[in-house]
Amino acid sequence: IPTEIPTSALVKETLALLSTHRTLLIANETLRIPVPVHKNHQLCTEEIFQGIGTLESQTVQGGTVERLFKNLSLIKKYIDGQKKKCGAERRRVNQFLDYLQEFLGVMNTEWIIES
Amino acid sequence: IPTEIPTSALVKETLALLSTHRTLLIANETLRIPVPVHKNHQLCTEEIFQGIGTLESQTVQGGTVERLFKNLSLIKKYIDGQKKKCGAERRRVNQFLDYLQEFLGVMNTEWIIES
């Protein structure tokens, strides 16, 4: 798979492959994988990809199921890249406060917060 | 501050306090703090709170600015609790795939993805 494929297209294709291979993936009835209790997905990327690793090691490879796991590893690579950009730029307090305000604003409007 | 205050109310109050104390917080003109390059904030919570720690250590405490940092530490506590819930429950592949599908769907529609 060329890594030049835009991440957004990669995600769309992966969603389709996930539906296609569902039956094969659920074949192992004893396997248990951590599933987050909440929907703040970005907080749980590490656990999600650990789960994908567990699933991959238990799934018979070949054909397009291999492409599914390859796609997922490219998505992980993208997210890891995003995480590296979290602390890459040292800015003035003003810019940090703007970002903090934005972060809290997003938390206020978009996060799934339990009472 | 009672930790019983709902997190959503805590976030709102913190946003207000941030505006109130902006002038005091930006007083240190030499201080530089890592600021994420992208807007996928949840990926960067660790770095954001490290930055808050740096800012707190450089800010003269007292009055409601102390409340601001107390609030921010309660928000961190909430996020840490959410992170603990990422891997707490081991479920069957079926549930994991439903969650993975949701995660990829959210990535597809809500994440800020650079080309």
Partner: antibody, heavy 119, light 107 residues
Framework: QVQLVQSGAEVKKPGASVKVSCKAS????????INWVRQAPGQGLEWIGY????????RYNQKFKGRATLTVDKSTSTAYMELSSLRSEDTAVYYC????????????WGQGTLVTVSS | DIQMTQSPSSLSASVGDRVTITCKAS??????LSWIQQKPGKAPKTLIH???RLIDGVPSRFSGSGSGQDFTLTISSLQPEDFATYYC?????????FGQGTKVEIK
């Protein structure tokens, strides 16, 4: 407070369809899955399926697949359960129930909607 | 599908009695089991989740135990308002399945 309020009782003829609504209030609708459960007169409880209002994804008990359709209207925080090709054995009270987390326990239940199928 | 077998199907007891209801799953469901109470003509109400975790507001006389395939609901001292039907529910795998219910009646 968190509430699920269901639509009123329905009487339908065999072969017809019924659509039961479940209006959520007191919480963010997209945060929790909505499950549907039914109970025939004097019988036990039976899971029909769940819908995730976050992404409109639904999953069904095979027994109801093809006949039950779960949908949501995010603008009104309402979940719907439509059952087609009704037969007399579909006479039951239909409940919606909120999932506390992801595939978790049912923490809030609707009051139930009686659907009677009779010619 | 996972079968849930509840026993007894009904029991008669007096106020103050200790009551035990059991539920057996046809396969390992970890601890993903809840206990539900239903009074005649009313909506069900969840009492316990994750096999042994009491839901807020539920009296402490209710307790749950077990993991894997065998589970128990205990009411330590039966109260008049506890006369109802009790169901177990496995939410470990799809489709979720209920036990057939245990009716607790006044002796």
């Amino acid at each position: 407070q968190v509430q699920l309020v269901q639509s009123g009782a329905e009487v339908k003829k065999p072969g017809a369809s019924v659509k039961v609504s479940c209006k959520a209030s007191g919480y963010t609708f997209t945060n929790h899955h909505i499950n549907w459960v039914r109970q025939a007169p004097g019988q036990g409880l039976e899971w029909i399926g769940y819908i995730n209002p976050y992404n409109d994804y639904s999953r069904y008990n095979q027994k109801f697949k093809g006949r039950a359709t779960l949908t949501v209207d995010k603008s009104t925080s309402t979940a719907y359960m439509e059952l087609s090709s009704l037969r007399s054995e579909d006479t039951a009270v239909y409940y919606c129930a909120r999932d506390y987390g992801n595939f978790w326990y049912f923490d809030v239940w609707g009051q139930g909607t009686l659907v009677t199928v009779s010619s | 599908d996972i079968q849930m077998t509840q026993s007894p199907s009904s029991l008669s007891a007096s106020v103050g009695d200790r009551v035990t209801i059991t539920c057996k799953a046809s396969q390992d469901i970890n601890s993903y089991l809840s206990w539900i109470q239903q009074k005649p003509g009313k909506a069900p109400k969840t009492l316990i989740h994750r096999a042994d975790r009491l839901i807020d507001g539920v009296p402490s006389r209710f307790s749950g135990s077990g993991s894997g395939q065998d589970f128990t609901l205990t009411i330590s001292s039966l109260q008049p308002e506890d006369f109802a039907t009790y169901y177990c529910l496995q939410y470990d795998d799809f489709p979720y399945t209920f036990g057939q219910g245990t009716k607790v009646e006044i002796k």
